[in-house]
Interface confidence: medium
């Protein structure tokens, strides 16, 4: 069986949430049982599509209703003919979407006015991904390339932070991290060094 992917580009880029049909042309064989393979594993997908072009020419489709990042990979199709498996050329499927967070800011407990760091990282495709930091509803830094570390000089009350990741497909917002104040024992040196009526918030540095 001469097996080839029909008309499809070797690299296929699809937006997240969109449908896609990968197609595979089998010539020189009647009624082939076409199996699709992704990254070396047979795709168990009953919901496929077939078109008989002629007696010895079939087109098989792998129909994905709504692609997500996990659908990205290398696909090919195969048929068995006389005990031998014929394998097609692969299609590389890339799934593009809004950025996906690999690191999000975590909740912290810090002493009043103590410096701390928050981290944020997001990936595409598409790249590049840039990060913007928010303190509550106020934008406090960015845009800067992902990954990003926010250096905060200190807070005097519980404060919420989040990051926003941008790429050509749009933006995604991270979880909101709450930075709580650690209770400081009355007799501690920390208590004597800090005046509770003085706001120690200074505009944080924003670094990659």
């Amino acid at each position: 069986a001469g097996l080839k992917l029909m008309g499809a580009p070797v690299k296929l880029t699809v937006s997240q949430g969109q449908p896609v049909k990968l197609n595979c042309s089998v010539e020189g064989m009647e009624e082939p049982d076409i199996q699709w393979v992704k990254d070396g594993a047979v795709v168990q997908n009953l919901d496929q599509l077939y078109i008989p072009v002629s007696e010895q020419h079939w087109i098989g489709f792998l129909s994905l209703k709504s692609v997500e990042r996990s659908d990205a990979g290398r696909y090919w199709c195969q048929v068995e003919d006389g005990g031998e498996t014929e394998i097609s050329q692969p299609v590389w499927l890339t799934v593009e979407g809004v950025p996906f967070f690999t690191v999000e800011p975590k909740d912290l407990a810090v002493p009043p006015n103590a410096p701390f760091q928050l981290s944020c990282e997001a990936v595409g495709p598409p790249e590049p991904v840039t990060i913007v930091w928010w303190r509550g509803t106020t934008k406090i830094g960015g845009p800067a390339p992902s990954p990003s570390v926010l250096n905060v000089t200190g807070v005097t009350q519980s404060t919420m932070f989040s990051c926003e990741a941008h790429n050509l497909k749009g933006l995604a917002s991270s979880r909101t991290a709450t930075v709580h104040l650690q209770l400081v024992p009355r007799g501690s040196s920390a208590h004597h060094h800090h005046h509770h009526h003085h706001s120690a918030w200074s505009h944080p540095q924003f670094e990659k």
Epitope: D33, D47, S66
Partner: antibody, heavy 125, light 108 residues
Framework: EVQLVQSGADVKKPGASLTISCQAS????????ISWVRQKPGKGLEWMGR????????YYGPSFQGHVTISADRSTATAYLQWRSLEASDTAMYYC??????????????????WGPGTLVTVSS | SYELTQPPSVSVSPGQTARITCSGD??????AYWYQQKSGQAPVLVIY???KRASGIPERFSGSSSGTMATLTISGAQVEDEADYYC???????????FGGGTKLTVL
């Protein structure tokens, strides 16, 4: 005209073996798939499994895996559903279905357009 | 194992719009199909691939899908539409089919 002729009703005792058949005509057998669907008396439809056009690929629902075997004979255009050991809970109507319908987009296997009349299997001691 | 959930029954008056829902975690990724079964008969395909009407099915039947919910809508239900309706889809891994429990549509 597409026709699926199923074997007649059968009464068996628990533990007995049974094979029911579904003979297709009016189309090229190897252009389509065959699925089997169970319907217990007064109950809903249950997908049992499907066999590919060549018979080289079979899929089974989790409730039926290991309990039934689906096979096909291309030379006689017949699909089979087989039990090695029947249970009382197997009492039901069994439909064979030609899986695959021609649509504007092509042939879709899950397009169950042609159904057999059903075979009633009763398992009782 | 994977399940599709349907309401057991829906009742409408003739001419009204009937909506039958089907929920399943994989429906954002897998197509829904709808089958009609009248008493004592084999099922008939009504809708395939979420919203496409099967051949010979009247225009009053339509389908839609959003998130984990698929919906069969019968606009202007008629007495002859009284039947059991089953949604069908495929497991998240794509390796077996599943019917919903069925919805008995009564057109009073």
């Amino acid at each position: 005209e597409v026709q699926l002729v199923q074997s007649g009703a059968d009464v068996k005792k628990p533990g007995a073996s049974l094979t029911i058949s579904c003979q297709a005509s009016g189309y090229t057998f190897t252009d389509y798939w065959i699925s089997w669907v169970r319907q217990k008396p007064g109950k809903g439809l249950e997908w049992m499994g499907r066999i590919s056009r060549h018979g080289s690929q079979t899929y089974y629902g989790p409730s039926f895996q290991g309990h039934v075997t689906i096979s096909a004979d291309r030379s006689t255009a017949t699909a089979y559903l087989q039990w090695r050991s029947l249970e009382a809970s197997d009492t039901a109507m069994y439909y064979c279905v030609r899986a695959g319908g021609q649509t504007s987009g092509g042939t879709i296997p899950e397009y169950y357009q042609h159904w057999g009349p059903g075979t009633l299997v009763t398992v009782s001691s | 194992s994977y399940e599709l959930t349907q309401p057991p029954s829906v009742s409408v008056s003739p001419g009204q719009t009937a909506r039958i829902t089907c929920s399943g975690d994989a429906l954002p990724k897998k197509y829904a199909y709808w089958y009609q079964q009248k008493s004592g008969q084999a099922p008939v395909l009504v809708i395939y691939e979420d919203h496409k009407r099967a051949s010979g099915i009247p225009e009053r039947f339509s389908g839609s899908s959003s998130g984990t919910m698929a919906t069969l809508t019968i606009s202007g239900a008629q007495v002859e539409d009284e039947a059991d309706y089953y949604c069908y889809s495929i497991s998240p891994a794509g390796n077996y089919g599943v019917f919903g429990g069925g919805t008995k549509l009564t057109v009073l």
